[in-house]
């Protein structure tokens, strides 16, 4: 399977909410011994390997923001912790998963990574990630709502297996 990032850049005004999205593509094993671990984190813009460094989002680590379920099941974080930080991650039946960030500040600007780990019990793990940039702007040239810029077809299948 692969992870696609439909949008590579989100430009949002200060104070707005944004939902960053990734999509699981390709055949997904729905066997009983397969579960999916999906999460989000911030990273520095690695010149060689994007998303190699895992930084917290609003002080929450990727462990705090993870979803854990089988196949294309729906799930979302019900953590009070995440919601207290204005964050919520969610996943639907179609392979889409997202993180919503509320009341954006300039500190939220940066590179965000989604990570999917396919866990085959008693066997191996398969990891893929996608990357996107969030720019939070202020002032007269900030958009009134978030503006999203589609990934190029090459970028949108942002496959990095580990």
């Amino acid at each position: 399977f692969k992870v696609a990032t439909p949008y590579s850049l989100y430009v949002c005004p200060e104070g707005q909410n944004v939902t960053l999205t990734c999509r699981l593509l390709g055949p997904v094993d729905k066997g009983h011994d397969v579960t999916f671990y999906k999460t989000w984190y911030r990273s520095s813009r690695g010149e060689v390997q994007t998303c190699s460094e895992r930084r917290p989002i609003r002080n929450l680590t990727f462990q705090d923001l993870h979803l854990h379920h089988g196949g294309h099941q729906a799930a979302n974080t019900s953590h009070d912790l995440a919601q207290r930080h204005g964050l919520e991650s969610a996943s639907d039946h179609h392979g889409n998963f997202s993180i919503t960030m509320r009341n954006l500040t300039l500190l939220d600007s940066g590179l965000y990574c989604c990570l999917v780990v396919e866990i085959r019990h008693h066997h191996s793990e398969h990891r893929v990630h996608g990357a996107m940039e969030l720019q939070v702007q202020t002032g007269k040239d900030a958009p009134s709502n978030c503006v999203v810029y589609p990934s190029s077809s090459q970028d949108s299948e942002n496959i990095t297996a580990a």
Epitope: R45, L106, G110, Q137, G139
Partner: antibody
Amino acid sequence: QSVEESGGRLVTPGTPLTLTCTASGFSLSDYAMTWVRQAPGKGLEYIGIISAGGYTYYASWATGRFTISKTSTTVDLKIPSPTAEDAATYFCARVGYADSSDIYKGFYLWGPGTLATVSS
Amino acid sequence: DVVMTQTPASVSEPVGGTVTIKCQASESISNYLAWYQQKPGQPPKLLIYLASTLASGVPSRFEGSRSGTEFTLTISDLECADAATYYCHCTDSIINYNFGGGTEVVVK
């Protein structure tokens, strides 16, 4: 369009100091503003920023040592308890290039600076 | 924090010569870098933003470029008026709006 700093003076260590940046020809609700300082013979040191919406953000070293606030026409930098290391020329600058408020384009419009001296 | 390491600290070149100033970011900052010129007793002046875009009124003798995390300011056909201190400035993140240490350019 211009910015000008004022309030720089000689104070003794620990005496609170407030520097003021006055904006002319543009609205502070349209741009982020920043404070940068320069000790005599030294380089530029970023202190912090106040966004168009009034949110403040500070360099990690400056957190707790400075407070930035604004009115409709001025931006203040408060130094609650200055030390000798805070003696410097303090610059106020508008963030963004030319008329753009894009925070990724640097600091375009600078004031001439105001000198704060801290000495006992 | 992103650390900006600027080299050299000082450089001296004759009129008509070329000066190259480098700035190394401690991590990737994309092209979010500005260059300033500062003369004694004056505030800094923005020369270049987004690594390579010249500010209006800046002569084309000034050129900015990027290779990964290394940024370069090149001043060609040096003039006496170019004598100043030059600073690079990370504009990637508002808590990392850090400046390089500066490079003094002396024109002989």
